[in-house]
Amino acid sequence: MKVLQEPTCVSDYMSISTCEWKMNGPTNCSTELRLLYQLVFLLSEAHTCIPENNGGAGCVCHLLMDDVVSADNYTLDLWAGQQLLWKGSFKPSEHVKPRAPGNLTVHTNVSDTLLLTWSNPYPPDNYLYNHLTYAVNIWSENDPADFRIYNVTYLEPSLRIAASTLKSGISYRARVRAWAQCYNTTWSEWSPSTKWHNSYREPFEQH
């Protein structure tokens, strides 16, 4: 049994890091493998992560962690029984994938304005709380070409757009994702999408 693709990990910079790897053949990850991990400098026992299958030869492990700080550096040991398959390290602050925003809501009761709000996925005491910026994706269910991205570069988790920038009388969906420039993170996953019917009074045109 060998590791074909070495584990790569990303951290949500809060409580979970996710590591993925591939074995050289079909593997029952949860029964055959264990990933041991701990802060390299910490006087403590190792934590054990039981991996799950992620495709035939792929494995994924969700590592539970204390609140992360920039100094943190983890040692990882991948074991198959008594055989050490791989040894590595992982610094969460250098591989951050933020949590996805939640509770995306479209408020249509403001006159001719759409107000989209969502929740910051981090508690106020987390470093990323004040460092997230967002991308909002709005698309038409009827017209695949009607697809737009709004970059929200301010901290407030909301976006205001004129209803008239979208077509009237049809259904739209929206979703939002986050990233943090300070840690050069990857984008988060998209939030679950929310749907609304866009309708507004078109201005009367005189000919």
Partner: antibody, heavy 116, light 110 residues
Framework: EVQLVESGGGLVQPGGSLRLSCAAS????????VGWVRQAPGKGLEYIGF???????YYANWAKGRFTISRDNSKNTLYLQMNSLRAEDTAVYYC??????????WGQGTLVTVSS | DIQMTQSPSSLSASVGDRVTITCQAS????????LAWYQQKPGKAPKLLIY???NLASGVPSRFSGSGSGTDFTLTISSLQPEDFATYYC??????????FGQGTKVEIK
């Protein structure tokens, strides 16, 4: 029973070397951090260093170069190799298991005397 | 090197007294709370009392408590018992892998 038992202490001449052993039972060294602490007669506790579950070692600045921590997973035993010993290294040497950033389990200690 | 300074170095107290020992670190400990307290009696190995500044170790009586954050920490014995006469040590934890001890505080019978 979960315990640590040190051995290997004794009288050694200045400049000499000594290797202390610490046998662990009831838990596995390859999934724990374990370290060494010493205490000179009538003095306080002094941190020497530790080895983490993955075999990475850390040392107090004063111990770097002269002291080496290692382990044998097959014997579930921790070692402390001490070289170029001096009179001021005379102390009781304890091995201890790490937990949540502290030492939660200690051996009974072994006395090392450096004297001519 | 990082220094852990305990005060007082020794104290005399009576059974039933409230006793407070302080520990000051020259640098903030890891996550502001990686600070442990130990009790040691003559000829015996140290015993863990408190870990991560305020958590009581298994089997330790509730009269022992710890508090503090960053560089300043306190061990309190709410009502001193005869078996509590001993020497107490603090120990800081750092992301450099250093775990220095304080010099100790000897609690003696008045």
């Amino acid at each position: 029973e979960v315990q640590l038992v040190e051995s290997g202490g004794g009288l050694v001449q200045p400049g000499g070397s000594l290797r202390l052993s610490c046998a662990a039972s009831g838990f596995s060294l390859n999934s724990n951090a374990v370290g060494w602490v010493r205490q000179a007669p009538g003095k306080g506790l002094e941190y020497i260093g530790f080895i983490n579950f993955s075999g990475i070692t850390y040392y107090a600045n004063w111990a770097k170069g002269r002291f080496t921590i290692s382990r044998d997973n097959s014997k579930n035993t921790l070692y402390l190799q001490m070289n170029s010993l001096r009179a001021e290294d005379t102390a009781v040497y304890y091995c201890a298991r790490g937990s949540a950033g502290s030492f939660d389990l200690w051996g009974q200690g072994t006395l090392v005397t450096v004297s001519s | 090197d990082i220094q852990m300074t305990q005060s007082p170095s020794s104290l005399s107290a009576s059974v039933g007294d409230r006793v407070t020992i302080t520990c000051q670190a020259s640098e903030s400990v890891y996550k502001n709370n990686y600070l442990a307290w130990y009790q040691q009696k003559p000829g015996k190995a140290p015993k863990l009392l408190i870990y991560r500044a305020s958590n009581l170790a298994s089997g330790v009586p509730s009269r022992f408590s710890g508090s503090g954050s960053g560089t300043d920490f306190t061990l309190t014995i709410s009502s001193l018992q005869p078996e509590d006469f001993a020497t107490y040590y603090c120990q800081g934890g750092y992301s450099s892998g250093m775990y220095p001890f304080g010099q100790g505080t000897k609690v003696e019978i008045k």
